[in-house]
C-alpha cells in the first residue's frame, strides 16, 4: 500500500518511517471509519503540516515550509485512510509527526517518526600523488554518518583515515588509503545503516605485462560474481593513466548497451560483453602506450577497479635502426 518508504512498527501508536532526501514519502495513519472526519497533521506538536475537515483541506495556517508539499488520499479518507503524502523530504523534515483524526465516533492520535537518509552513490578513485599511489573511497553526500571499512586481501584494516566535511544537511566523506608498492587487492565498504544500503569498492592489481612495440595486448576485466548483478544498470570504463591523469579510452553503458570508443586501436568483443566479460584489446602498441590501464565497473552498489600495468618495449627491429 505504501511503496515510497518503509515503516518499522513500534509500540504506543508510533511508527518509524524512513525516507530518502528529495524523494516523496507517505506518513501512514489509519482510523476506524466514521462520519464528519477531521484530520490534523502536526510536526513536533507545534507546526501545522496539514488540516482537513468539513470535506476539504484547510491550509490557511499551514506552516510555510510545507506549502505545496502535502496532500491526503482524498478518495480513501472515507475508508479510514488518513495517511499524508509528503513531497521532496529534506533533512530538516526529520522529527515526530502527530496525526489527529476525529470522527463522530472517536478521536485518535497517531505518532509517526520520520527519519531521512542520504546516500549519493559513492566512488572509488585511484590516484597517484608524486611517487605515492592512493585509493580513495568517497561519498559526496551522506546522512547519517556512514560506517567505512577497508580490507586488504579480505582482511580488515584498522587504519582508516576519514576526511569529513559537514554541510547544512549532510556529510561529504573521503577515506584515502596509501597503497604504494602493494600488489594486494583492496576493498572499501560504505554502509548507511539508516537506509540499510551498502556500497562496495574493490581494487585489484593485475600482474604487469611486457609487450613489444607493434604487438597487441589483451587486458582482462571480469566482474566478481559476489557484487555483480547483470540486471542492475552499470557502466564500464577503460582508461589509461598518463602523467598522473586518466584519459578515457572507451566506455559501455548497460542500460542502452552502447559502447563508445575514443581510441581507434581499442577493441571490445561484443560476444564477451554479452557474457559480462569486459576484457579489451589494444592493437599496434607503441612506446607511449606504456602505463597503467584501469577498468572501472560501477553501479549504484559497487565499483570494481582492475589495474593493469603495461610495459611496451622497442622491438628488435626498432632497436637495431637506432
Amino acid at each position: 500500500i505504501f511503496p515510497l518508504a518503509f515503516f518499522i512498527y513500534v509500540p504506543m501508536n508510533e511508527q518509524i518511517v524512513i525516507g530518502r532526501l528529495d524523494e516523496d514519502i507517505i506518513l501512514p495513519s489509519s482510523f476506524e471509519r466514521g462520519s464528519e472526519v477531521v484530520i490534523h497533521w502536526k510536526y513536533q506538536d507545534s507546526y501545522k503540516v496539514h488540516s482537513y475537515y468539513k470535506g476539504s483541506d484547510h491550509l490557511e495556517s499551514q506552516d510555510p515550509r510545507y506549502a505545496n508539499r502535502t496532500s491526503l488520499f482524498y478518495n480513501e479518507i472515507q475508508n479510514g485512510n488518513a495517511s499524508l503524502f509528503f513531497r521532496r523530504v529534506s533533512l530538516l523534515d526529520e522529527g515526530i509527526y502527530t496525526c489527529y483524526v476525529g470522527t463522530a465516533i472517536q478521536v485518535i492520535t497517531n505518532k509517526v517518526v520520520l527519519k531521512v537518509g542520504v546516500f549519493l552513490t559513492p566512488v572509488m578513485k585511484y590516484e597517484k600523488r608524486n611517487t605515492n599511489s592512493f585509493l580513495i573511497c568517497s561519498v559526496l553526500s551522506v546522512y547519517p554518518r556512514p560506517i567505512i571499512t577497508w580490507k586488504m586481501d579480505n582482511t580488515p584494516i584498522s587504519e582508516n583515515n576519514m576526511e569529513e566535511t559537514g554541510s547544512l544537511d549532510s556529510f561529504s566523506i573521503n577515506s584515502p588509503l596509501n597503497i604504494t608498492g602493494s600488489n594486494s587487492s583492496y576493498e572499501c565498504t560504505i554502509e548507511n545503516s539508516l537506509l540499510k544500503q551498502t556500497w562496495t569498492g574493490r581494487w585489484t592489481m593485475k600482474d604487469g605485462l611486457h609487450k613489444m612495440q607493434s604487438e597487441h595486448v589483451s587486458l582482462s576485466c571480469q566482474p566478481v560474481n559476489d557484487y555483480f548483478s547483470p540486471n542492475q544498470d552499470f557502466k564500464v570504463t577503460w582508461s589509461r593513466m598518463k602523467s598522473g591523469t586518466f584519459s578515457v579510452l572507451a566506455y559501455y553503458l548497460s542500460s542502452s548497451q552502447n559502447t563508445i570508443i575514443n581510441e581507434s586501436r581499442f577493441s571490445w568483443n561484443k560476444e564477451l560483453i554479452n557474457q559480462s566479460d569486459f576484457s579489451m584489446n589494444l592493437m599496434d602498441l607503441n612506446l607511449s602506450d606504456s602505463g597503467e590501464y584501469l577498468c572501472n565497473i560501477s553501479s549504484d552498489e559497487y565499483t570494481l577497479l582492475t589495474i593493469h600495468t603495461v610495459h611496451v618495449e622497442p622491438s628488435q627491429e626498432t632497436a637495431s635502426h637506432n
Partner: antibody, heavy 120, light 107 residues
Framework: QVQLVESGGGVVQPGRSLRLSCAAS????????MHWVRQVPGKGLEWVAV????????DYADSVKGRFTISRDNSKNTLYLQMNSLRVEDTAVYYC?????????????WGQGTLVTVSS | DIQMTQSPSSLSASVGDRVTITCRAS??????LAWYQQKPGKVPKLLIY???TLQSGVPSRFSGSGSGTDFTLTISSLQPEDVATYYC?????????FGPGTKVDIK
Amino acid sequence: QVQLVESGGGVVQPGRSLRLSCAASGFTFSNYGMHWVRQVPGKGLEWVAVIWYDGSEKDYADSVKGRFTISRDNSKNTLYLQMNSLRVEDTAVYYCAKDLISGIYYVDHWGQGTLVTVSS
Amino acid sequence: DIQMTQSPSSLSASVGDRVTITCRASQGISNYLAWYQQKPGKVPKLLIYAASTLQSGVPSRFSGSGSGTDFTLTISSLQPEDVATYYCQKYQSAPFTFGPGTKVDIK
C-alpha cells in the same frame, strides 16, 4: 462520563474583568475543541468562542471580539474565558461545552453553566 | 455574517402529532447544521448533526433534512418529554450562530 464544571461567575461592574474556568473530566481533554456559549435567562443561546484541541486556532463572536480571550491548559484539563471591559449586555449564564470533534464546531456535551451578572 | 432564522417561534401540538420546525440560513451552509433540544431548566442536548445524522442515544422519532439554506427538524410522533425549546446552529464557518429557537409544548 464527560463532566464539565464551570466556575468564576458572579456580579461585576461594567468595565471590569472576570475570568471563567471550566474543569473537564471523563474524556481526553487534549483531543477536543472547546466552546463557550452563553444564554440570557429565558432567552436563546449565543455562541461566544471556540478553541481547538491544541489551542492553535481560536474564533470569537463579533459581540465579544477584542474583549474576551479563550484559552486552555491541557495539562490541567481546564478551559478559560478571560472577559475584559464587561458590559451590561454580557449578563448571561456561561456554558462551557465540548466539541464533538475539533474542527467541526458543534457541541455534544455541556456544563451546568455559571451566571455572570454585569451591573452597576 | 450568515443569519439563522427559525419558524415558528413557538407551537403547541397534541401527543402523537407530527411536528415540523424549519431553520433558514441567509446564505448556503451545505449540510453544516446541528439541532439541539433544551428542556426547561436543563442544559442543551445535541439531537442531530450534519443536517440529518442522528446523535447516538437520540430517539428515532427525531429526524433532520435539508441542505444549503433550508433545513427541517421533524418529530414524527410528539411525546410529553419532547416539551422543550429547539435550536438550530450553523457550523460551516465562524461565527457558529444559533437560531433564535422554537418553543414546543403540548396542547
